[in-house]
């Protein structure tokens, strides 16, 4: 805070604004009868330099001229760009305790002359907008710099506006506030920007343009779409535009898409027919406008119109599969399953499925509708049955898909050969096979079907399946495949009226089982021991069990146990062994083996055979 220079004055030579690299002389002079009261000769004038209100230097050593007690001149050099404050203070040397007293101060601004403004660009937004121009000012001047934008045109049209740049604001755009109208479409206009500050001035090159060069139409507004006869694929897009627009660009895409469909429309007059839309799909539409076919600029894109196209009747065919089981002496239960149509086939919200079961010879027909993707019925075991399913939305139904109900595993000659299942990674299994050797009818297709080897509801846990063309001999199954679970996989070969199948077990990842089987009983029959067990609970199997091992050794023996290895079959829960000595007490236990290794042993049972040794 500088007082109003009561004690003296500070002046700068050559000026308080200097170019970068120049030196300046600062003179500090006391007014008459000012100074240290008793001893004028003891007046000492000092000059302090401040940058951003922080004292950075005492210029005591930079004195170049001194009238003792009255005035001093200091030379300052190497001043940095921007503003530097200098404060002159009076130090009365005989009074050491009193701080120096401010006399006066001065600000020196260091900067550069403005460069010629470049890259002038002008726009008028819309037919009724005003002309605004922007430019590149070049290097920062660090001084207050005034810019003048001048426009001249036909019929002695002239117009100018001004703004300035300093350390608080930048001036590189001005709105002239005038409107160029379409009747001046062919006329040429010239703009120029002049920059001036205390160190110099410069002017841009003249920039010439026409009405079409600079007028950017307003983006179209009030966009809407009308679907012809509630069609899901054809619609008329409508919008409002400025009167002079001759060209539009339309872009549209389904909401989940990453690429736009682009259309150019000439003289559309706010209307365009689209014919390739996908039914029952959320779309986003945007429009841009241009005032001239060859020249001029495109408007910004309009705000998006988001809407869903209407439904159309489903297309495509359902992928049907079935399961059949005999449920009494003359009836069978048919469970039909089908996969949902994908959205491009469903073309709407599927309201229900129409299911038909028909006995071909007697013309018995069972019909029903369901909202589920499965349907179960009990029918006679006799006769040749066929099933069909179609999907319906609000606009209609798909063509029915037919499937003949055959005994899926009934024909041994149609059983595929050399079926194998290999773990590919954590969540898929590669199944391969060879065609049936002696099929008496042609294979129309293969079905690879898989189910987890753990208890499930027939209707709640439908099968998973893949249809494979007859010339393919492999399938990568991944749907609902989880690690550490064993799956039973069937490969069906289907002809027109027969089916054959082969089964294999497979897993995508395995570990050794958590525990071994639990021995529940040991019984002796005809000099053989029968070991009975309960299977390992499904969550503890951790993959496909390849075999069980039964171990035994004499009680208290330190010898290695003997063992018998049994191929795993879920239906088997007992096994005979016949190499134990009578009246010797043995300890028996079991383990289970997956491809990853052997489980810890299950429970131990002791047994002493009574019979004669084999």
């Amino acid at each position: 805070n500088i007082d109003v220079c009561k004690l003296g004055t500070v002046t700068v030579q050559p000026a308080p604004v200097i170019p970068l690299g120049s030196a300046a002389n600062i003179s500090c002079s006391l007014n008459p009868k000012q100074g240290c009261s008793h001893y004028p000769s003891s007046n000492e004038l000092i000059l302090l330099k401040f940058v951003n209100d922080v004292l950075v230097e005492n210029l005591h050593g930079k004195k170049v001229h001194d009238h003792t007690g009255h005035s001093s001149t200091f030379q300052v050099t190497n001043l940095s760009l921007g503003m530097t404050l200098f404060v002159c203070k009076l130090n009365c040397s005989n009074s050491q305790k009193k701080p120096p007293v401010p006399v006066c101060g001065v600000e020196i601004s260091v900067g550069v002359a403005p460069e010629p403004p470049q890259n002038i660009s002008c726009v008028q937004e819309g037919e009724n907008g005003t002309v605004a121009c922007s430019w590149n000012s070049g290097k920062v001047t660090y001084l207050k710099t005034n810019y003048t934008l001048q426009l001249s045109g036909p019929n002695n049209l002239t117009c100018q506006k001004q703004c300035f740049s300093d350390n608080r604001q930048n001036c590189n755009r001005l709105d002239l506030g005038i409107n160029l109208s379409p009747d001046l479409a062919e006329s040429r206009f010239i703009v120029r920007v002049t920059a001036i500050n205390d160190l110099g001035n410069s002017s841009s090159l003249p920039h010439t343009f026409t009405f079409l060069d600079i007028v950017i139409p307003l983006p179209p507004w009030d966009i809407r779409i009308n679907f012809l006869n509630a069609s899901g694929s054809r619609g008329t897009l409508q919008w409002e535009d400025e009167g002079q627009v001759v060209l539009n660009q339309l872009r549209y895409q389904p909401l989940n898409s990453t690429s736009w469909n682009m259309v150019n429309a000439t003289n559309a007059k706010g209307k365009y027919d689209l014919r390739d839309l996908r039914p029952f799909t959320e779309y986003e539409f945007q429009i841009s406008s241009k005032l001239h076919l060859s020249g001029g600029s495109w408007s910004n894109w309009s705000e998006s119109l988001r809407t869903r196209t209407p439904e159309e009747e489903p297309v495509g065919i359902l992928d049907i599969w079935y399961m059949k089981q005999d449920i009494d002496y003359d009836r069978q239960q048919i469970s039909l399953f089908w996969k949902s149509l994908n959205p491009s086939e469903a073309r709407g919200k599927i309201l229900h499925y129409q299911v038909t079961l028909q006995e071909v010879t007697k013309k018995t027909t069972l019909q029903n509708t369901t909202r589920h993707t499965s349907w179960t019925r009990v029918i006679p075991r006799t006769g040749a049955w066929t099933a069909s399913v179609s999907a319906a939305n609000s606009k209609g139904a798909s063509a029915p898909t037919h499937i003949n109900i055959v005994d899926l595993c009934g024909t041994g000659l149609l059983a595929p050969h050399q079926v194998s299942a290999k773990s590919e990674n954590m969540d898929n299994i590669l199944v391969t096979w060879q065609p049936p050797k002696k099929a008496d009818s042609a294979v129309r297709e293969y079905i690879v079907e898989w189910r987890a080897l753990q208890p499930g509801s027939i209707t709640k846990f439908p099968p998973h399946w893949l249809r494979i063309p007859p010339d393919n001999m492999s399938a990568l199954i991944s749907e609902n495949i989880k690690p550490y679970i064993c799956y039973e996989i069937r490969v069906h070969a289907l002809s027109e009226s027969q089916g054959g199948c082969s089964s294999i077990r497979g897993d995508s990842k395995h570990k050794a089982p958590v525990s071994g089987p639990h021995i529940t009983a040991i019984t002796e029959k005809k000099e053989r021991l029968f070991i009975s067990w309960t299977h390992i609970p499904f969550p503890e199997q951790r993959g496909c069990i390849l075999h069980y091992r039964i171990y035994w050794k004499e009680r208290d023996s330190t010898a290695q146990p003997e063992l018998c290895e049994i191929q795993y079959r879920r239906s088997q829960n007992s096994h005979p062994i016949s190499s134990l000595q009578p009246r010797v007490t043995y300890v028996l236990w079991m383990t289970a083996v997956t491809a990853a290794g052997e489980s810890p042993q299950g429970n131990e049972r002791e047994f002493c055979p009574q019979g004669k040794a084999n």
Epitope: Q325, W375, L453, S457, T459, K460, F461, E488, R490
Partner: nanobody, 119 residues
Framework: QVQLQESGGGSVQAGDSLRLSCTAS????????MYWYRQAPGKQREFVAY???????NYLDSVNGRFTISRDNAKNSVYLQMNSLKPEDTAVYYC?????????????WGQGTQVTVSS
């Protein structure tokens, strides 16, 4: 294992009604498809009705419209409401549950409850 227990059988006149109940216990987490069967003296056991996890039901033609199968999942129970009973409905009625493991169907049976319909 799954245990099934039927109740509600008895002797009635033709035209009367009975309600059979079947309660499941044990490892029933995967049992959703429940059936009623019957076996008349000197005949083979035959399917009567079933109900699926989604409450879809199906019936033997000769009982359709007279019998209704229903379930109460909270009580792990399935019921067979038998109306307009006929002498030919006389049989031992069995509750049955089926579950699938891989492609093998495991079946569980109750011990049966006698229904006698006299004219």
């Amino acid at each position: 294992q799954v245990q099934l227990q039927e109740s509600g059988g008895g002797s009635v006149q033709a035209g009367d009604s009975l309600r059979l109940s079947c309660t499941a216990s044990g490892s029933i987490f995967a049992i959703d498809d429940m059936y009623w069967y019957r076996q008349a003296p000197g005949k083979q056991r035959e399917f009567v009705a079933y109900i699926t996890a989604t409450n879809s039901a199906n019936y033997l033609d000769s009982v359709n419209g007279r019998f209704t199968i229903s379930r109460d999942n909270a009580k792990n129970s399935v019921y067979l409401q038998m109306n307009s009973l006929k002498p030919e409905d006389t049989a031992v009625y069995y509750c049955n549950a089926k579950q699938i493991v891989g492609f093998q169907i495991d079946e569980y049976w109750g011990q049966g409850t006698q229904v006698t319909v006299s004219s």
